[in-house]
């Protein structure tokens, strides 16, 4: 029969024959022969291969360097890489999470729309009318102005996006 020019999924062409790829978690040792299947070996400790492959070397698991603020979120296996995340108060600088930076704080006049995670930074939003933030914080949302009316008080000083309203007693009508 004619030697194949293409092979099925999970196979590769070598020496005019189709050989099985090594399964995830294993590397290629020797191509298949006319008598035997492909020879593969498991990846070593701290190594992985995540696809059907003909790789001669397994990949090293990612190292979550604590000096860069990283910690292990999910330990790698022979078939998966280690997933790093950042220490509390820090977040990844990229999708690959190779280093971390401190969560940003929202300045006065801005509140936290979304609290930061290990992989995303704080999202701030300007405090709309009726709300304020007088602190720089990575957690505080914009607070609503105090309602003077509900306390039987009146507004003595209008609020801003950075300050609350100041309430005071109502003026009494003289007899």
């Amino acid at each position: 029969p004619e030697p194949p020019t293409a092979c099925r999924e999970k196979q590769y062409l070598i020496n005019s024959q189709c050989c099985s790829l090594c399964q995830p978690g294993q590397k290629l040792v020797s191509d298949c022969t006319e008598f035997t299947e492909t020879e593969c070996l498991p990846c070593g400790e701290s190594e992985f291969l995540d696809t059907w492959n003909r790789e001669t070397h397994c990949h090293q698991h990612k190292y979550c360097d604590p000096n860069l603020g990283l910690r292990v979120q999910q330990k790698g296996t022979s078939e998966t890489d280690t997933i790093c995340t950042c220490e509390e108060g820090w977040h990844c600088t990229s999708e690959a999470c190779e280093s971390c930076v401190l969560h940003r704080s929202c300045s006065p006049g801005f509140g936290v729309k979304q609290i930061a995670t290990g992989v995303s930074d704080t999202i701030c939003e300007p405090c709309p009318v009726g709300f304020f933030s007088n602190v720089s914080s990575a957690f505080e949302k914009c607070h609503p102005w105090t309602s003077c009316e509900t306390k039987d008080l009146v507004v003595q000083q209008a609020g801003t996006n950075k300050t609350d309203v100041v309430c005071g007693p109502q003026d009494r009508l003289r007899a």
């Epitope: 040792v29 020797s30 191509d31 022969t33 070996l41 003909r54 001669t56």
Partner: antibody, heavy 116, light 110 residues
């Protein structure tokens, strides 16, 4: 067709050296681990060493560590075994074999005799 | 790195079945399914008969079969024939990334 042809064997005195070669053909040499296996006269098989595709991984049986060195030249489709500090107990037929831990193909062997 | 343990000799009559055992440790036979069996006729190079515990290379008679339980692998030859008379060796990959062979078993067909 796969062919493995060993050469370089011979008579050598204890403490001497030899370099064995294995010329490979009929397959993609550079994508296969290769091994050396020996057999003393009238005795069983003994695995000696193996080497991965690019030569970055090499493994040896304890009894030859520090004395034998396995290497390869993918451009020449050749496998080598450098034998130093030879002892009488190294006397054997030395076979090269294709693969890392299972061997469908063997050479015809080259005889190493260590004797004074 | 001591050799895997095989019986020195086994014999059987034509048509019978025989089993050759190969005992290792949890660092070799028991660690992986990377056990092979070789047949060696006098003056010849070894021939692969079984690989990865149970797989038979194409061209090898289906009278040859392999199995493993714990740290012991076995080669069974059924319907014994005169041409099966030979030495048989097991080999196993180890956790040290090395290979280890058994001492060999001489099979005699009576």
């Amino acid at each position: 067709e796969v062919h493995l042809v060993e050469s370089g064997g011979g008579l050598v005195q204890p403490g001497g050296s030899l370099r064995l070669s294995c010329a490979a053909s009929g397959f993609t040499f550079s994508s296969n681990w290769m091994s050396w296996v020996r057999q003393a006269p009238g005795k069983g098989l003994e695995w000696v060493a193996n080497i991965n595709q690019d030569g970055s991984e090499k493994y040896y049986v304890d009894s030859v560590k520090g004395r034998f060195t396995i290497s390869r030249d993918n451009a020449k489709n050749s496998l080598y075994l450098q034998l130093n500090s030879l002892r009488a107990e190294d006397t054997a037929e030395y076979y090269c074999a294709r693969g890392g831990y299972r061997y469908a193909y063997w050479g015809q062997g080259t005889l190493v005799t260590v004797s004074s | 790195q001591s050799a895997l343990t095989q019986p020195a000799s086994v014999s059987g009559s034509p048509g019978q079945s025989i089993t050759i055992s190969c005992t290792g440790t949890s660092s070799d036979v028991g660690a992986y399914n990377y056990v092979s069996w070789y047949q060696q006729l006098p003056g010849k190079t070894p021939k692969l008969m079984i690989y990865d515990v149970t797989n038979r290379p194409s061209g090898v008679s289906n009278r040859f079969s392999g199995s493993k339980s714990g740290n012991t692998a076995s080669l069974t030859i059924s319907g014994l024939q005169a041409e099966d008379e030979a030495y048989y060796y097991c080999g196993s990959y180890t956790t040290s990334s090395t290979l280890i062979f058994g001492g060999g078993t001489e099979l005699t067909v009576l």
